[in-house]
């Protein structure tokens, strides 16, 4: 009998309000045994896959999607989905990325008050991949 797959979660580091030109990393989390994580943008019209999955905790795995230099066009809604053989999960909740004009000089803070300012600590470091999943009829247009 196939297991019910839990919904993935999504977060952003260092936060969801990012100055133009700064970096942001989306973090997708799911259960142990995920082969592929997919970051979807704006109702699945574009997406990026990764099989580079790490061990986040005893019960979770995760993948990271980094945008090195955020542009205005990167603003929008993002969500995660994963493939754990033999099926795909449901989508995560949406996370909205806001891009703001940089104000001030090089000493301006990169993050909004209250946002996490660095990568989360992970007890163990690893990676992942396997067979590429079925594309569900979507076109793999790069998000960044």
């Amino acid at each position: 009998q196939e297991e019910d797959l839990p919904r993935p979660s999504i977060s952003a580091e260092p936060g969801t309000v990012i100055p133009l030109g700064s970096h942001v990393t989306f973090v997708c989390r799911g259960p142990v045994g995920v082969q592929t994580f997919r970051l979807e943008r704006d109702s699945r019209s574009t997406y990026n896959d990764t099989e580079d999955v790490s061990q986040a905790s005893p019960s979770e795995s995760e993948a990271r999607f980094r945008i090195d230099s955020v542009r205005e066009g990167n603003a929008g809604l993002y969500r995660c989905i994963y493939y754990k053989p033999p099926k795909w999960s449901e989508q995560s909740d949406y996370l909205e990325l806001l891009v703001k004009e940089s104000s001030g000089g090089p000493d301006s803070p990169d993050t909004e008050p209250g946002s996490s300012a660095g990568p989360t600590q992970r007890p163990s470091d690893n990676s992942h991949n396997e067979h590429a999943p079925a594309s569900q009829g979507l076109k793999a247009e790069h998000l960044y």
């Epitope: 142990v32 990764t50 690893n126 396997e130 590429a132």
Partner: antibody
């Protein structure tokens, strides 16, 4: 079909250097973590090095036995994986496998290239 | 580093036997355990990941079980083509480590 083809092995003297290459095809190379695993003649398997994908900043990890001597790198535009081996020791003699990984497990293996370190 | 200890370095078995190979980790590896089969002159082949998940194309006579520190690879009815060396490997933390291998030989 996933294909991993290693090259660059051979006979080298102790303290010498060698660079191994691995040509990858049949899968999306740039979204995968990649590994080198070795096997000394008649012995078991030993993980050597790992390199993550661009979305994880190409982070690298090494076995203690090769740290500061070996360097793993990749060229995503050419789907190539490399292992630069410096200051080689006789105990580095082994068959070196290029591996497409899982989340730390090893899903697809090349046929390996033999490195012999001997005076 | 996490040490991986396999039950024995070799087994003498008969065709049709049920074979069980055990692997013990020095600490909890949270089911991040893989099994490989290696035949002489060939590269290893992944059989099982996440302790129990059978890879595509691996015969159903192979199965994996276990959790915590203790894991098992079972072959329900040994076939000629199963004569090989089997390795376990943990991927909970780096450095990734293998067991010493268990060689199956026909009696």
């Amino acid at each position: 079909e996933v294909q991993l083809v290693e090259s660059g092995g051979g006979l080298v003297q102790p303290k010498g250097s060698l660079k191994l290459s691995c040509a990858a095809s049949g899968f999306t190379f740039n979204t995968n973590a990649m590994y080198w695993v070795r096997q000394a003649p008649g012995k078991g398997l030993e993980w050597v090095a790992r390199i993550r994908s661009k979305s994880s900043n190409y982070a690298t990890y090494y076995a203690d036995s090769v740290k500061d001597r070996f360097t793993i790198s990749r060229d995503d535009s050419q789907s190539m994986l490399y292992l630069q081996m410096n200051n080689l020791k006789t105990e580095d003699t082994a068959r070196y496998y290029c591996v497409r990984g899982g989340s730390g497990f090893f899903a697809y293996w090349g046929q390996g290239t033999l490195v012999t370190v001997s005076a | 580093d996490i040490q991986m200890a396999q039950s024995s370095s070799s087994f003498s078995v008969s065709l049709g036997d049920r074979v069980t190979i055990t692997c013990k980790a020095s600490e909890d590896i949270y089911i991040r355990l893989a099994w490989y089969q290696q035949k002489p002159g060939n590269a290893p082949r992944l059989l099982i990941s996440t302790a129990t998940s059978l890879e595509t194309g691996v015969p159903s006579r192979f199965s994996g079980s276990g959790s915590g520190k203790d894991y098992t690879l079972s072959i329900t009815s040994l076939q000629t083509e199963d004569v090989a060396t089997y390795y376990c490997q943990q991927y909970w933390s780096t450095p990734y480590t293998f067991g010493g291998g268990t060689r199956l030989e026909i009696k």
